[in-house]
């Protein structure tokens, strides 16, 4: 079971690509995360 903490995890755009080792994560909640994250309960657990 994945642990997925909506408050402490950060997010990176999948398709933007990275310039070699310069990866940028943002700490803002993705607008569709509330829709998206619970849709596969077998693979993740949301910790409030």
């Amino acid at each position: 079971m994945e642990d997925f903490n909506m408050e402490s995890d950060s997010f990176e755009d999948f398709w933007k690509g990275e310039d070699l080792s310069n990866y940028s994560y943002s700490s803002t909640l993705p607008p569709f995360l509330l829709d998206a994250a619970p849709c596969e309960p077998e693979s993740l657990e949301i910790n409030k």
Epitope: S10, E12, D13, F14, G17, E18, F32, A36, L44
Partner: antibody, heavy 120, light 116 residues
């Protein structure tokens, strides 16, 4: 649950244009890039470019520069890909895709695909 | 020479472990790139499996079983997708991809056949 729902199959004449739509159902387009990827029959995927739904900024693959235009209408949570000056070798399934990653897991969403056939 | 080269086909028996390779063109160092892996079955879009750069920089696709894992072979300048405990439903085409020169580049794909 987020779904990307694409417009239906198209048959086009060489030299014409096609515009494919991609609607986010069950969520917004979000701030994450929407990529367009095409796949010709029996071939591997080919990336065409992406659009940032927030800013409308685009990044097109060099091969498609000048022939592709990616736009979005945030009011209806829909992205568009228009390809002009169509040739028979543009016959392919066109997909939109979006997603984001945390440090351990990635959520990636694909449209069901739109078959575009270019034939005289 | 293609940026990414994959063997065109591979066959293995159920229960086996298989390694699918994605070789980067000479001059493009595998250690500098995240290698992305996709599975595609007929009539469906590609599905993201995982991406791998190192053991400290790897992400699994949502819902993808842990029997799909990534690694790299620096000496061969290749990314590797390892599938353990092969199942009949793993029969599919597998594509690798990298972000290179401000564009996504896909390999030609490997068609994996599960025997029997």
């Amino acid at each position: 649950q987020v779904q990307l729902v694409q417009s239906g199959a198209e048959v086009k004449k060489p030299g014409s244009s096609v515009k494919v739509s991609c609607k986010a159902s069950g969520g917004t387009l979000s701030s994450y890039a929407i990529s367009w990827v095409r796949q010709a029959p029996g071939q591997g995927p080919e990336w065409m470019g992406w659009i940032n739904p927030n800013s409308g900024g685009t990044n097109y693959a060099q091969k498609f520069q000048g022939r592709v235009t990616m736009t979005r209408d945030t009011s209806i949570s829909t992205a568009y890909m228009e390809l002009s000056r169509l040739r028979p070798d543009d016959t392919a399934v066109y997909y939109c895709a979006s997603g984001f990653c945390t440090r351990t897991i990635c959520f990636v969403y694909w449209g069901q695909g739109t078959l575009v056939t270019v034939s005289s | 020479q293609a940026v990414l080269t994959q063997p065109s086909s591979l066959s293995a028996s159920p229960g086996a472990s298989v390694s699918l390779t994605c070789t980067l063109r000479s001059g493009i160092n595998v250690g500098a790139y995240r290698i992305y892996w996709y599975q595609q079955k007929p009539g469906s879009p590609p599905q993201f499996l995982l991406r791998y750069k190192s053991d400290s920089d790897k992400q699994q696709g949502s819902g993808v079983p842990s029997r799909f894992s990534g690694s790299r072979d620096a000496s061969a300048n290749a990314g590797i997708l390892l599938i353990s405990g092969l199942r009949s439903e793993d029969e599919a085409d597998y594509y690798c991809a990298i972000w290179h020169s401000s564009a996504w580049v896909f390999g030609g794909g490997t068609q994996l056949t599960v025997l029997g």
